[in-house]
Amino acid sequence: VPEKSVRWCAVSEHEATKCQSFRDHMKSVLPSNGPSVACVKKASHLDCIRAIAANEADAVTLDAGLVYDAYLAPNNLKPVVAEFYGSKEDPQTFYYAVAVVKKDSDFQMNQLRGRKSCHTGLGRSAGWNIPIGLLYCDLPEPRKPLEKAVANFFSGSCVPCADGTDFPQLCQLCPGCGCSTLNQYFSYSGAFKCLKDGAGDVAFVKHSTIFENLANKADRDQYELLCLDNTRKSVDEYKDCHLARVPSHTVVARSVGGKEDLIWELLNQAQEHFGKDKSKEFQLFSSPHGKDLLFKDSAHGFLKVPPRMDAKMYLGYEYITAIRNLREGTCPEAPTDECKPVKWCALSHHERLKCDEWSVNSAGKIECESAETTEDCIAKIMNGEADAMSLDGGFVYIAGMCGLVPVLAENYNTPNPNCENTAEEGYFAVAVVKSSSDLTWDNLKGKKSCHTAVGRTAGWNIPMGLLYSKINHCRFDEFFSEGCAPGSEKNSSLCKLCMGPSPNLCEPNNKEGYYGYTGAFRCLVEKGDVAFVKHQTVPQNTGGKNPDAWAKNLKEEDYELLCLDGSRKSVQEPANCHLARAPNHAVVARKDKADCVQTLLLDQQRMFGSSVTDCSSNFCLFESKTKDLLFRDDTVCLAKLHDRNTYEKYLGEEYVKAVTNLRKCSTSPLLEACTF
């Protein structure tokens, strides 16, 4: 059946031969209605990429550099299956490119000019492309030829395989720049030896190099890693201190109509039957005809790449920056240490309009980028399309797991002028019911629930975490008869109560009328039995404080809070009747942009923060008629975090533990991608 056929692209006679053997052996073990292999031969990997894009083939395995080519328009391919190395229990799909230095040296990443450098080889990923790509804009002009610019940047180098005649400085530490193991400083171990011997000041290698060359921890402790934020870390902290994370070898397919499920089905079956130590007659990860045919010989198996993971996310911001710099050779005109405009990520059109107004008032210091969901915004910040946004704690957790960092906290209770330097304890997550109902925390089953959105703190993580520990399963849509939890599956009973309008029904943004704190409260007012919100929601939307038609006549005393002990209390008593304390919303950014974002926001709030009294004739950053656009409307200021500058420290151990427990119920495709 053609639609069940995966057309594998081969790039040599030997690969074509192995592909045919792969095809024949898969035919013998798979049912006739299962996936099958067809082989397409092309002259190069780039030809394979074009063939897949043109629907003349379906799949090929590529190195990271080629995954980048495959992702570029007009190819638009995406990673679908990753080879893994190491054990099945601890599968490695990535390696980390690192800059290793001796502990007793005292320079940082931004002080490499004039140092001596050790590289694995010219044109190699960890040893050349990544470090030189990231340093590209610091190289002296003209930057072409690249080797000359690098020679003029470092005071001496060993770059195996470089032309020692044209660029003698690149071979200063290893005369002749030998391109094989005859050169003692060749490849990973050689580059590390170049540092160890004292020939060079820095070695550009992969994270495992130091462990492979120094078995003794005491010896390893003589070395450190240079981090991109101009700090240093120990060599075992490579996950938090690297130049780039590089995918090893990846199967790519079309982004649309790419047969990714079929490709996975095929490769999963293939590894079961012909993986490491599975079969004598055909081996997926070796070949008598040559090395690394179709797949790497060192691979141990395959892992399915999560569907939310596109090529940008898979390759990572640092890797793409490095390769793009090298390929395109363009650098910003402004010096790299100068803050460019900060690109704020706005959710849907309501936030975009407020962001645009902010942009005009900031005279362009703020630019705007839009996305339809919070997770899409986080992804845009990760890949550099946006820089920052303010997030509920539940999304601070996801953003943190995706490598972003908290920059400033929203403060709600501290009056100026101390606000900016005060760390607040957080707000209360509460369950609100109508005073006229007889509901308690213990009889919510079968009732109608209203949530701010899936994945948010007060509206989801806290109440559903508590519920999970009571019911021990994740079928929350069965516990409540119906509800509105924006971000739920559209056919779920937890979208039944949402107001839309269609096609925005149950979308986790302001186009859904029951989204957010105010939306969840409105859902309670109009349709629901219980709303999970912040403790300030009822006072902020009653007594005429919200002029919208649905809210203008509401009275605070018509609502009560549910306490965990089964009692109920007035909405004025959240301190004695809440579900949990929630961390304040916080602004997040990429690490490389964090200082810039902080400086700019502190400046912006001095102009447009809560000191502005007349918001009808002035732009106010923390005002949007109860809609919480960009920031919560009750924000008094954005406050410095001091030492709470990681998501774990910011959210606190207890909350992180609660959200981690809920991950077994996670519906977050982004979280799945970021933890791949």
């Epitope: 407020k354 107004e357 005009v360 004739s617 732009f619 949007s624 809609k627 656009l629």
Partner: nanobody, 117 residues
């Protein structure tokens, strides 16, 4: 509530000029920020230019150096002077008063600008 009415659009050749006006039925003097947006067929509405009460302006990269936004609080009017027009400037142009628009959709009818030879 202030109603905004856009005018001044039309058909113009590439390289030509147009001046759009946005007249408010009430006072715009207290409006913090006014802006012009445009929407081409099948595309999202995008910010073209904005101006604050104090006269701070911001332009989309694609129109910088060609378009100029101004406001006359006494006349309750916002203008967009468009020079060196290009075919890609073809769109319906809308004016907005942010203090009303971003929590509810208050958009006028817009004015069509077509740049074609």
């Amino acid at each position: 509530q202030v109603q905004l009415v856009e005018s001044g659009g039309g058909l113009v050749q590439p390289g030509g000029s147009l001046r759009l006006s946005c007249a408010a039925s009430g006072s715009i003097g207290s409006s913090a920020t006014m802006a012009w947006y445009r929407q081409a067929p099948g595309k999202q509405r995008e910010l073209v230019a904005g101006i604050t009460r104090g006269g701070t302006t911001k332009y989309a990269d694609s129109v910088k150096g060609r378009f100029t936004i101004s406001r006359d609080n006494a006349e309750n009017t916002v203008y967009l002077q468009m020079n060196s027009l290009k075919p890609e400037d073809t769109a319906v142009y809308y004016c907005t008063d942010y203090s009303r628009s971003y929590y509810e959709d208050h958009w006028g009818q817009g004015t069509q600008v077509t740049v074609s030879s």
